[in-house]
């Protein structure tokens, strides 16, 4: 038997992936656990193996189909269970009736690239990945720039309240190394949250021209 508190949190990426994290206080040593998904109105069901991500938490991704296929809608309810092996039987450790479009977390933006860089400004673009066509252009973004001598947590957040997959960073210092990240969020869903931050994009501003005022 397992004592202690348990937390089971899952998010839908809006297309064909449900990612889950299960944390359990009284840690289970060497126990095989999985997440099982049973939709109420679909012919498929899916399982993924929970793998440790820390001392007392496990994670896995339920792959529902091809990455850009629309596997669920607003009326779907998916029963998600954490099952752990106890001898020859499986024990239900956690259960939830999951409404996918109330629990959205999109994939991190991808393909970040510097479009144009100058001494004081830099134009950066990116793409969104596996976002449902239901959202059309109605997404919001947050971006942040890492300056020398600062941490990501100190970086001010820039908010883009529309599906704008580029940004022009201004008032940068010449000949300076920066890093840039962006994340995305749809408008829909009571428990919807920001995507993970993108992989950081490193860039360097151009040096100021010699003898010119900077």
């Amino acid at each position: 038997a397992v004592n202690g508190t348990s937390q089971f949190t899952c998010f839908y990426n809006s297309r064909a992936n449900i990612s889950c994290v299960w944390s359990q206080d009284g840690a289970l040593q060497d126990t095989s656990c999985q997440v099982h998904a049973w939709p109420d109105r679909r012919r498929w069901n899916q399982t993924c193996e929970l793998l440790p991500v820390s001392q007392a938490s496990w994670a896995c991704n339920l792959i529902l189909g091809a990455p850009d296929s629309q596997k669920l809608t607003t009326v779907d309810i998916v029963t998600l269970r954490v099952l752990c092996r106890e001898g020859v039987r499986w024990r239900v450790m956690a259960i939830q009736d999951f409404k996918p479009f109330e629990n959205l977390r999109l994939m991190a933006p991808i393909s970040l690239q510097v479009v144009h860089v100058e001494t004081h400004r830099c134009n950066i673009s990116w793409e969104i990945s596996q976002a449902s066509h239901y959202f059309e252009r109605h997404l919001e973004f947050e971006a942040r720039t890492l300056s020398p001598g600062h941490t990501w947590e100190e970086a001010p957040l820039l908010t883009l309240k529309q599906k704008q997959e580029w940004i022009c960073l201004e008032t940068l210092t010449p000949d300076t190394q920066y890093e840039f990240q962006v994340r995305v969020k749809p408008l829909q869903g009571e428990f919807t949250t920001w995507s993970p931050w993108s992989q950081p994009l490193a860039f360097r501003t151009k040096p100021a021209a010699l003898g010119k005022d900077t």
Partner: nanobody
Framework: QVQLVESGGGLVQTGGSLRLSCAVS????????MGWYRQVPEKQRELVAD???????KYADSVKGRFSILRDSVKNTVYLQMSSLKPEDTGIYYC?????????????WGQGTQVTVSS
């Protein structure tokens, strides 16, 4: 402004058939589910049948094998083919559409069409 227009209701004898249709029109939207609900006096509106994207149909137990739902996503129209009708199928039939507008999802209802099955 979104509008749902239902048609096809009427009076029919026990064992007879009817075909309801409901068309959604209006400003820019994406539909992910359309269906039919039934209301009888002193009772809550209840699901008869609906169809979500991916051809995922859901039917009330009481109509399985007798009613069939068909959705035309291009025309934004949903049909309910009702056969082997019974007096207990009598009620006001409402069309419901789940629509995505400007990145948010909402449910929209039609005005209802009366179906009466006489014995």
């Amino acid at each position: 402004q979104v509008q749902l227009v239902e048609s096809g209701g009427g009076l029919v004898q026990t064992g007879g058939s009817l075909r309801l249709s409901c068309a959604v029109s209006g400003s820019h939207f994406i539909s992910d589910v359309m269906g039919w609900y039934r209301q009888v006096p002193e009772k809550q509106r209840e699901l008869v049948a609906d169809m979500a994207d991916g051809n995922s149909a859901k039917y009330a137990d009481s109509v399985k094998g007798r009613f069939s739902i068909l959705r035309d996503s291009v025309k934004n129209t949903v049909y309910l083919q009702m056969s082997s009708l019974k007096p207990e199928d009598t009620g006001i039939y409402y069309c419901k559409a789940g629509l995505w507008i400007a990145g948010r999802h909402s449910d929209y209802w039609g005005q209802g069409t009366q179906v009466t099955v006489s014995s």
